[in-house]
C-alpha cells in the first residue's frame, strides 16, 4: 500500500525558517503534490503550494520555495513573519496525486523537542498518518 | 479549441471484437491522462479503462480485465479501446474523455460518444 | 472500490426552487469530488471539481460543498436551463467511481 511520509524541520540558523518535507512511498508517476497547513486542503486547511512535475509549482504566502528533491519528493521552504513562531504548532499536510491510482496524504508537525540550537537537522523520518 | 471525436462504435455478435478511436485535437495530447467512460442503457456511468498521459500505468474495470486494451498514440493524438470477446452488458454508449490533474483528475473535456450494442 | 451513493434519484422543481443533491462516499474520499451535468442528447459536462470549485463559465447559482464521505451539491435558483442530470464522482481511488444520478426535471 502506497503511503505518505511528512517531516518538518526547523532551520538551525533561522528561528524563523521552516521546512517542510514530503515523500510518496510506492508504485507509480507523481501527477500533483498539493502541501497545505492547519489541516488537509478542503478540510478546514489552507493551500501553501501546488506542484506538478511538468508544468511547474505554484506557492502562497508564507511558502517561500516549493521544489521537488526527488521524483517522489518535495520540499517547502516556510518564512516565518511573526516573532512567536505560530509554525511550531501548526499541523503540515501533504497529498500526493498519481493516475490513475489515486491520493495518498499524511500530516505532521514540528517535533516537540525540536531545539535547533543543540543539533544539526535531523534525518528524514517518517511520520505517517493513514488514510484522511 | 479542444475536442475529442470518437469513432469506430457499432453492432457486433456476442463474443465479437470492435476497435474504438478517439481523435484529440485542441490540446497537448501526450500531456493528459485519458479515459474511456461508458453510460449503460440504464444510464449509469462507469470508467472502463484509463491511462496516464506517459502510458507507464493503465487501470481496467474489473468485469473487462483481460478483454479490453486501452492504448495511446501520442504522435497521432488518438486513443484506442480494442474490445474483445463482448458481452451484452458491454452495449453501452462509450466516451472518451480527458483528465485535468489541477481539477483532481476531474474529467473536463469528453467527446460525443459512440455507440456499441452487443447482440446476440 | 469506492461505492458513491447519491440521493435523490428524481427531482421534479419549479424555476426558482432551490435544491439540494446529496453524495455519501462509502469511504473517506477527502475533497477529490467532482460534479457532471448532462443535459438530454449530450455528453456529461465538468461542473465542480475538488468538491467546491467551479469549473469555467459555471455560474454561481451551482454550489459545492462536504469533506470525507458527505457531498451536497445545491442549485440556489433552478432555471430552465437546468433540466438534466447530475452526477457526482470520487477521483480519490481507483477506480473511479460515479453515483448513480439525479434526474432534476422542471416543473
Known amino acids: 500500500t502506497p503511503e505518505v511520509w511528512v517531516q518538518v524541520q526547523m532551520e538551525a540558523t533561522e528561528l524563523s525558517s521552516f521546512t517542510v518535507h514530503c515523500g510518496f512511498l510506492g508504485p507509480g508517476s507523481i501527477s500533483l503534490v498539493t502541501v497545505s497547513w492547519g489541516g488537509p486542503d478542503g478540510a478546514g486547511g489552507t493551500k501553501l503550494a501546488v506542484l506538478h512535475p511538468e508544468l511547474g509549482t505554484r506557492q502562497w504566502a508564507p511558502a517561500r520555495q516549493a521544489r521537488w528533491e526527488t521524483q517522489s519528493s518535495i520540499s517547502l521552504a516556510l518564512e516565518d513573519s511573526g516573532a512567536s513562531s505560530p509554525f511550531a504548532n501548526t499541523t503540515f499536510c501533504c497529498k500526493f496525486a498519481s493516475f490513475p491510482e489515486g491520493s495518498w496524504e499524511s500530516c505532521g508537525s514540528l517535533p516537540p523537542s525540536s531545539d535547533p540550537g543543540l543539533s544539526a537537522p535531523p534525518t528524514p523520518v517518517p511520520i505517517l498518518r493513514a488514510d484522511l | 479549441d479542444v475536442k475529442l471525436v470518437e469513432s469506430g462504435g457499432g453492432l457486433v455478435k456476442l463474443g465479437g471484437s470492435l476497435k474504438l478511436s478517439c481523435a484529440a485535437s485542441?490540446?497537448?495530447?501526450?500531456?493528459?491522462?485519458m479515459s474511456w467512460v461508458r453510460q449503460t442503457p440504464e444510464k449509469r456511468l462507469e470508467l472502463v479503462a484509463a491511462?496516464?498521459?506517459?502510458?507507464?500505468?493503465?487501470y481496467y474495470l474489473d468485469t473487462v480485465k483481460g478483454r479490453f486494451t486501452i492504448s495511446r498514440d501520442n504522435a497521432k493524438n488518438t486513443l484506442y479501446l480494442q474490445m474483445s470477446s463482448l458481452k451484452s452488458e458491454d452495449t453501452a454508449l462509450y466516451y472518451c474523455a480527458r483528465h485535468e490533474d489541477y481539477y483532481g483528475f476531474a474529467m473536463d473535456y469528453w467527446g460525443q460518444g459512440t455507440s456499441v450494442t452487443v447482440s446476440s | 472500490s469506492i461505492v458513491m451513493t447519491q440521493t435523490p434519484k428524481f427531482l421534479l422543481v419549479s424555476a426558482g426552487d432551490r435544491v439540494t443533491i446529496t453524495c455519501k462516499a462509502s469511504?473517506?474520499?477527502?475533497?477529490?469530488v467532482a460534479w457532471y451535468q448532462q443535459k438530454p442528447g449530450q455528453s456529461p459536462k465538468l461542473l465542480m471539481y475538488y468538491v467546491s470549485n467551479h469549473y469555467t463559465g459555471v455560474p454561481d447559482r451551482f454550489i459545492g460543498s462536504g469533506y470525507g464521505t458527505d457531498f451536497t451539491f445545491t442549485i440556489s435558483t433552478v432555471q430552465a436551463e437546468d433540466l438534466a442530470v447530475y452526477f457526482c464522482?470520487?477521483?480519490?481511488?481507483?477506480?473511479?467511481?460515479f453515483g448513480g444520478g439525479t434526474k432534476l426535471e422542471i416543473k
Open positions: 491511462i496516464n498521459s506517459n502510458v507507464i500505468s493503465t
Open positions: 485542441g490540446f497537448t495530447f501526450s500531456s493528459y491522462h
Open positions: 464522482q470520487q477521483a480519490y481511488r481507483s477506480p473511479w467511481t
Open positions: 469511504q473517506s474520499v477527502t475533497n477529490d
